[in-house]
């Protein structure tokens, strides 16, 4: 028979032969030959390969460096890499999560629209009319101005996006 020019799924062509790829979690030790099947070996501790492959070396699991604010979110297996995330109050600087930065705080006049996670930063929004924020915070939303009317009071000082209204007693002087 003619030597193959293409192989089936999960095979590779070498020396005019179709050899089986190694399954995820295993590395190639020896290509198949006329006399033998492909020889594969499991990846060692702290190593992985996540695809059908012909790699002669497994990849090292990612190290979640605490000095960079990282911690393990999901421990790696022989078939998957370790997934890192950031310590409380920090978030990843990239999708690969190789380092962390402190969550951003929303300045006075801005409130938290979306609280930060291990992988995304705080999202702030300006306080609209009727709302305010007088603190720099990574958690506080814009608060509504106090309703003087419901307290049977009147507005003595208008609110801003950074300050609440100031209520005062009704003026009792009648003409």
């Amino acid at each position: 028979p003619e030597p193959p020019t293409a192989c089936r799924e999960k095979q590779y062509l070498i020396n005019s032969q179709c050899c089986s790829l190694c399954q995820p979690g295993q590395k190639l030790v020896s290509d198949c030959t006329e006399f033998t099947e492909t020889e594969c070996l499991p990846c060692g501790e702290s190593e992985f390969l996540d695809t059908w492959n012909r790699e002669t070396h497994c990849h090292q699991h990612k190290y979640c460096d605490p000095n960079l604010g990282l911690r393990v979110q999901q421990k790696g297996t022989s078939e998957t890499d370790t997934i890192c995330t950031c310590e409380e109050g920090w978030h990843c600087t990239s999708e690969a999560c190789e380092s962390c930065v402190l969550h951003r705080s929303c300045s006075p006049g801005f409130g938290v629209k979306q609280i930060a996670t291990g992988v995304s930063d705080t999202i702030c929004e300006p306080c609209p009319v009727g709302f305010f924020s007088n603190v720099s915070s990574a958690f506080e939303k814009c608060h509504p101005w106090t309703s003087c009317e419901t307290k049977d009071l009147v507005v003595q000082q208008a609110g801003t996006n950074k300050t609440d209204v100031v209520c005062g007693p009704q003026d009792r002087l009648r003409a």
Epitope: N15, S16, V29, E34, E39
Partner: antibody
Framework: QVQLQQPGAELVKPGASVKLSCKAS????????IYWVKQRPGQCLEWIGG????????NFNEKFKSKATLTVDKSSSTAYMQLSSLTSEDSAVYYC????????WGQGTTLTVSS | DVVMTQTPLSLPVSLGDQASISCRSS???????????LHWYLQKPGQSPNHLIY???NRFSGVPDRFSGSGSGTDFTLKISRVEAEDLGVYFC?????????FGCGTKLEIK
């Protein structure tokens, strides 16, 4: 071209050890196992075992596990088989062989165990 | 261990004749990957073995097409369609499906 070079003959006394060599050339040494085969006159060939030069991993015929030790020297592209506690039963022709993209045999080393 | 039994032990032929050698294994040589690792080779006096056929029916490069292999499971045959003088020697079958690899004890092809 692929070549496996073996010394022609070795004469050794009973009880001693001998280290047979197989020098490979013409290909990337670490890419293929080297296997060893024993042939005694009038008897069937016997497969002794093989070694992967990439990592030194071996597979053996259980019958030869305590008789043969397989090693490689990557720097000189040479495979070795050490045979220990030799007796007349070990007198034979020993071939090294490699397969993958063709099959190649050394010329064989004739081992004579005699006092 | 898998026992490989070759018949006949000696096969006298006339040049130009067809020759047929049988090899039987004590268990199936079908590997879990679908391949059958049964091989044939020829050894001439004072020489190393020379492989002819691998995996039942695949000829090695340079092997004339008068050599053909067939069979499956435990029963295998090597045929030489028209024997030439250079074909004389001892033919062996071997299996590499199961460890330890094992060999037949040979069939001597000689002139009648």
């Amino acid at each position: 071209q692929v070549q496996l070079q073996q010394p022609g003959a070795e004469l050794v006394k009973p009880g001693a050890s001998v280290k047979l060599s197989c020098k490979a050339s013409g290909y990337t040494f670490i890419s293929y196992y080297i296997y060893w085969v024993k042939q005694r006159p009038g008897q069937c060939l016997e497969w002794i075992g093989g070694i992967n030069p990439r990592n030194g991993g071996t597979n053996f015929n259980e019958k030869f596990k305590s008789k043969a030790t397989l090693t490689v020297d990557k720097s000189s592209s040479t495979a070795y088989m050490q045979l220990s506690s030799l007796t007349s039963e070990d007198s034979a022709v020993y071939y090294c062989t490699r397969h993958g993209n063709g099959v190649y045999w050394g010329q064989g080393t004739t081992l004579t165990v005699s006092s | 261990d898998v026992v490989m039994t070759q018949t006949p032990l000696s096969l006298p032929v006339s040049l130009g004749d067809q020759a047929s050698i049988s090899c039987r294994s004590s268990q199936s040589l079908l590997h879990s990957n679908g391949n059958t690792y049964l091989h044939w080779y020829l050894q001439k006096p004072g020489q190393s073995p020379n492989h002819l056929i691998y995996q039942v029916s695949n000829r090695f490069s340079g092997v004339p097409d008068r050599f053909s292999g067939s069979g499956s499971g435990t029963d295998f045959t090597l045929k030489i369609s028209r024997v030439e003088a250079e074909d004389l020697g001892v033919y062996f079958c071997s299996q590499t499906t199961h460890v330890p690899w094992t060999f037949g004890c040979g069939t001597k092809l000689e002139i009648k």
